[in-house]
């Protein structure tokens, strides 16, 4: 008996031949012996099976003794073994059909699980491997699962079932709802306006949720919420700001803040957290703030950063085309009695500068000038 | 109930096309396939072609290959018929049919049991 | 193609009255006929197929017999509403083919 397998919801095609290579009479049935289809000379005649208005054929084969059955729309209930009956022959053909179906939904949020489950006719043993975008092999029964989805999980998941030594491919596309990154971080001169990007990793039709930056500055003991905001099909409108920060919203996406100036005590790290709507769960994206100020006063010139720093980053005072000064692991430094030039404080990570302010130092008897 | 409801009447003149079109209601549409029959006035009906909605393929009468074309449209459940090349023994009305059932469910092409209410087309100079 | 010849091609006859129309098939088809009532304006109405089966919600006046070429649509007891023209139709072969019609008329 020759064996097909099918995908649920799409179309097989059940072959049948003649020896003759002639339109003659055929039958197609099922195990149950009711008529599916056949001809009634060069017509297609369909008996009362379920399959009724699913069950076609080809009648351009019909002349070259080709007789094939097609069903469109496969449900796992229509396997069954098929009789093609011609020339007082029987040919018979076992049909299963397979469905393989993620969750709950194909839009899941970072760190959630996916899980695939296969749905078999009665009787059949199947085994699935799955192969994710990102290249894991999985392997299962009838559920596949995946804990914690990461972003490179988005895309199409190639699953493979394997029944009687044959194989039937599904795709299934996974959409890992996430910002493209975790956390980011922004260095700024004090003064300067800080810009605040969140980009999402995935594009939707209609996007549809809610939305608040949380704010821990460096300097306050406790954290407070600068934004709140709404998110109808792609449009954001701003709910709540406080009055200071007074951050301004883009209006449409990708996530946009704008901070009118850094200042010492706005540097910290904040939280964009994003429900979705019909989501359990947030997406979440850590943002922090470093602002670098260079002042002197008197003999003293002092350059300072706030806000979150890695250990391994260097602070380093030094006149413009000379050595540095003075250079430090730490989050200020100073030079007594600077002489007079244009004096760069810098902020660097292995030798590339992540952040620098200039200050001009003038003869004593001056008074300095920022620029 | 099984319903085909057919374009309105048209006045074309020789050498032009015409497109009836019968959209299907009452039944599923890719199921079945879609005859047309066409009658001039006082004659008999002569059959034009067959489409099989689901598939699209068509089978045409030897005398209107060429000239006819028979296209289907499965999202709004509607098949057309072209007929180019017109004459004015072209005039007609013409019928799109579909196959009939029993009580018991068996279902047979070759009979035409539901038919649209028909589309006079006139050829005219 | 499969001719398909009716006789009479018209016929008058009274209300009540036994009426008889043949179809003869050019080659065998089987019992692969149907029989058609066609009033003025109106698309053409599925009355008989597989030569004897009554289409369903058809009155029980009507009957058809044969088998292979010959072919016969009866009318036991002519009413008031059956005054039309019938039409026989082979599916048995592509393509489907038509008789050329008999009208019966009130005599």
């Known amino acids: 008996k020759k064996v097909v397998l099918g995908k649920k919801g799409d179309t097989v095609e059940l072959t049948c031949t003649a020896s003759q290579k002639k339109s003659i009479q055929f039958h197609w049935k099922n195990s149950n012996q009711i008529k599916i289809l056949g001809n009634q000379g060069s017509f297609l005649t369909k008996g009362p099976s379920k399959l009724n208005d699913r069950a076609d054929s080809r009648r351009s084969l019909w002349d070259q003794g080709n007789f094939p059955l097609i069903i469109k729309n496969l449900k796992i209930e229509d396997s069954d073994t098929y009789i093609c009956e011609v020339e007082d022959q029987k040919e018979e053909v076992q049909l299963l059909v397979f469905g393989l179906t993620a969750n709950s939904d194909t839009h899941l949020l970072q760190g959630q699980s996916l899980t695939l489950t296969l749905e078999s006719p009665p009787g059949s043993s199947p085994s699935v491997q799955c192969r994710s975008p990102r290249g894991k092999n999985i392997q299962g029964g009838k559920t596949l699962s995946v804990s914690q989805l990461e972003l490179q999980d988005s895309g199409t998941w190639t699953c493979t079932v394997l029944q009687n030594q044959k194989k039937v491919e599904f795709k299934i596309d996974i959409v890992v709802l996430a910002f493209q990154k975790a956390s980011s971080i922004v260095y700024k001169k004090e003064g300067e306006q800080v810009e605040f990007s969140f980009p999402l990793a995935f594009t939707v039709e209609k996007l549809t949720g809610s939305g608040e930056l949380w704010w821990q500055a460096e300097r306050a003991s406790s954290s407070k919420s600068w934004i709140t905001f709404d998110l109808k099909n792609k449009e954001v409108s701003v709910k709540r700001v406080t009055q200071d920060p007074k951050l301004q919203m883009g209006k449409k996406l990708p996530l946009h803040l704008t901070l009118p100036q850094a200042l010492p005590q706005y540097a910290g790290s904040g939280n964009l957290t994003l429900a979705l709507e019909a989501k359990t769960g947030k997406l979440h994206q850590e943002v922090n703030l470093v602002v670098m100020r260079a002042t002197q006063l008197q003999k003293n010139l002092t350059c300072e950063v706030w806000g979150p720093t890695s250990p391994k980053l260097m602070l380093s005072l030094k006149l413009e085309n000379k050595e540095a000064k003075v250079s430090k692991r730490e989050k200020a430094v100073w030079v007594l009695n600077p002489e007079a030039g244009m004096w760069q404080c810098l902020l660097s990570d292995s030798g590339q500068v992540l952040l620098e302010s200039n200050i001009k130092v003038l003869p004593t008897w001056s008074t300095p000038v920022q620029p | 109930q099984v319903q085909l409801v057919q374009s309105g009447a048209e006045v074309k003149k020789p050498g032009a096309s015409v497109k009836v079109s019968c959209k299907a209601s009452g039944y599923t549409f890719t199921g079945y396939y879609m005859h047309w029959v066409r009658q001039a006035p006082g004659q008999g009906l002569e059959w034009m072609g067959w489409?099989?909605?689901?598939?699209?393929?068509?089978g045409y009468a030897q005398r209107f290959q060429g000239r006819v074309t028979m296209t289907r449209d499965t999202s709004t459940s509607t098949v057309y018929m072209e007929l180019s090349s017109l004459r004015s023994e072209d005039t007609a009305v013409y019928y799109c049919a579909t196959g009939g059932s029993d009580s018991s469910g068996y279902y047979y092409e070759g009979y035409f049991q539901h038919w649209g209410q028909g589309t006079l087309v006139t050829v005219s100079s | 193609d499969i001719q398909m010849t009716q006789s009479p091609s018209s016929l008058s006859a009274s209300v009540g009255d036994r009426v008889t129309i043949t179809c003869r098939a050019s080659q065998t088809i089987s019992n692969w006929l149907a029989w058609y009532q066609q009033k003025p304006g109106k698309a053409p109405k599925l009355l008989i197929y597989?030569?004897?089966t009554l289409q369903s919600g058809v009155p029980s006046r009507f009957s058809g017999s044969g088998s292979g070429t010959d072919f016969t649509l009866t009318i036991s007891s002519l009413q008031p509403e059956d005054f039309a023209t019938y039409y026989c139709?082979?599916?048995?072969?592509?393509?489907?083919?038509f008789g050329q019609g008999t009208k019966v008329e009130i005599k």
């Open positions: 489409m099989n909605p689901n598939s699209g393929d068509t």
């Open positions: 597989a030569a004897s």
């Open positions: 139709q082979q599916a048995n072969s592509f393509p489907p083919t």
